[in-house]
């Protein structure tokens, strides 16, 4: 049902990384516009992206209010130039999104190695604690602030001269690893939330190697 030439949105998909969250859908509009609504399971619907010709809507501002809530969105279709018009049941056509719980589902963004420092046969590798768009007490929280003990990092490291990789894990943002004296090493890190069933791991960080600007070397 619905007004002539108005089609319901379909393929509603949540795209979310480090809580930056966008709802995408199809089709590209022809003589129609869309409005999105979002709600928690127990809350009221809030309208966003009014009468847009886009096929995406940034819902970050809504979901960061409580990333542990479960959200549902719906996309309404209206005839272009006649947004008061409704379907045969007296309502505009709409389609529901899948449920989305940001804390359990947002993708982990690609981490960055902030620095590494060698002291003798030990190297300290520090992962940047990326800022999210989640706020508390008027400050933006870091990824660690939000995920706390649920977030670990895996370090992959190898001698520049060979391909054999070793791994280390930390529940902080720092690694302290043993290295061979006189050897240069390369590093890459990955964020992991072991308790998840989906989106458990980030992509690997860019590789950083000793002997480049980011690190510091001290012979003790």
């Amino acid at each position: 049902s619905g007004t002539t030439n108005t089609v319901a949105a379909y393929n509603l998909t949540w795209k979310s990384t480090n809580f930056k969250t966008i709802l995408e859908w199809e089709p590209k509009p022809v003589n129609q516009v869309y409005t999105v609504q979002i709600s928690t399971k127990s809350g009221d619907w809030k309208s966003k992206c009014f009468y847009t010709t886009d096929t995406e809507c940034d819902l970050t501002d809504e979901i960061v209010k409580d990333v542990k809530q479960t959200y549902l969105a719906r996309v309404f279709s209206y005839p272009a130039g006649n947004v008061e018009s409704t379907g045969s049941a007296g309502e505009p056509l709409y389609e529901n999104s899948p449920e989305f719980t940001p804390y359990l589902e947002t993708n982990l963004g690609q981490p960055t190695i902030q620095s590494f420092e060698q002291v003798g046969t030990k190297v300290n590798v520090t992962v940047e604690d990326e800022r999210t768009l989640v706020r508390r007490n008027n400050t933006f929280l870091s990824l660690r602030d939000v995920f706390g003990k649920d977030l670990i990092y895996t370090l992959y490291y190898w001698k520049s001269s060979s391909s054999g990789k070793k791994t280390a894990k930390t529940n902080t943002n720092e690694f302290l690893i043993d290295v061979d004296k006189g050897e240069n090493y390369c590093f890459s890190v990955q964020a992991v939330i072991p308790s998840r069933t989906v989106n458990r791991k980030s992509t690997d960080s860019p590789v950083e190697c000793m002997g480049q600007e980011k690190g510091e070397f001290r012979e003790i």
Partner: antibody, heavy 121, light 109 residues
Framework: QVQLQESGAEVKKPGASVKVSCKAS????????IEWVRQAPGQGLEWMGE????????KYNEKFKGRVTMTADTSTNTVYMELSSLRSEDTAVYYC??????????????WGQGTLVTVSS | QAVVTQEPSLTVSPGGSVTLTCRSS?????????ANWIQQKPGQGPKTLIS???NRGPWTTARFSGSILGDKAVLTLWGAHAEDEADYYC?????????FGGGTHLTVQ
């Protein structure tokens, strides 16, 4: 408001199993860890394990591994803790607790009222 | 498994201040241990005062504060009242499990 309602007291014989329930309300059940802590008479608190209902991920105290099982039913917002091969030293009050809002505050925010389990022949 | 150590008992005068400590057998306590301080009065269930080292619960009076001092987690109570007499437990997180200290019995007299 957040509430954790535990099941009633149990009396069990040595070697039996007990299953304690913890029904949660007032928040998004799937997103918060539920901790299980016990306290024997006149003794301190002892952590048994935790479960994240949304993924059924669990972590157990090594001391109880093989004897304890934690499960979650997201349709009823209830977490269960089953302890098997009971012995007299398992006589205790068993508490469930929910963690805090965000990571930097992790821990034991809201507590159930406790379930007394008595193991006696 | 790590051992978490607390003073078995402490006494404070009404209106006085007292510091309870929480030590880890594995080395210095850090913010990654997410220290929790839990109060339990006789015949009652536990009540968490502080989580994540220094975050007060909404029900926690400002007379309690948590911090890390040197290599230990500490709970400081200012202006002790008679109703603060209780057992106080510290809990520390170690990568994949919590460990409770043996508790400190605080007497206000």
């Amino acid at each position: 408001q957040v509430q954790l309602q535990e099941s009633g007291a149990e009396v069990k014989k040595p070697g039996a199993s007990v299953k304690v329930s913890c029904k949660a309300s007032g928040y998004t059940f799937s997103s918060y860890w539920i901790e299980w802590v016990r306290q024997a008479p006149g003794q301190g608190l002892e952590w048994m394990g935790e479960i994240l209902p949304g993924s059924a991920s669990t972590k157990y105290n090594e001391k109880f591994k093989g004897r304890v099982t934690m499960t979650a039913d997201t349709s009823t917002n209830t977490v269960y803790m089953e302890l098997s091969s009971l012995r007299s030293e398992d006589t205790a009050v068993y508490y469930c607790a929910r963690d805090y809002y965000y990571g930097s505050s992790y821990g034991f925010a809201y507590w159930g009222q406790g379930t007394l389990v008595t193991v006696s022949s | 498994q790590a051992v978490v150590t607390q003073e078995p008992s402490l006494t404070v005068s009404p209106g006085g201040s007292v510091t309870l400590t929480c030590r880890s057998s594995t080395g210095a306590v850090t913010t990654s241990n997410y220290a929790n301080w839990i109060q339990q009065k006789p015949g009652q269930g536990p009540k968490t005062l502080i989580s994540g080292t220094n975050n007060r619960g909404p029900w926690t009076t400002a007379r309690f504060s948590g911090s890390i001092l040197g290599d230990k987690a500490v709970l400081t109570l200012w202006g002790a009242h008679a109703e603060d007499e209780a057992d106080y437990y510290c809990a520390l997180w170690y990568s994949n499990h919590w460990v409770f200290g043996g508790g400190t019995h605080l007497t206000v007299q």
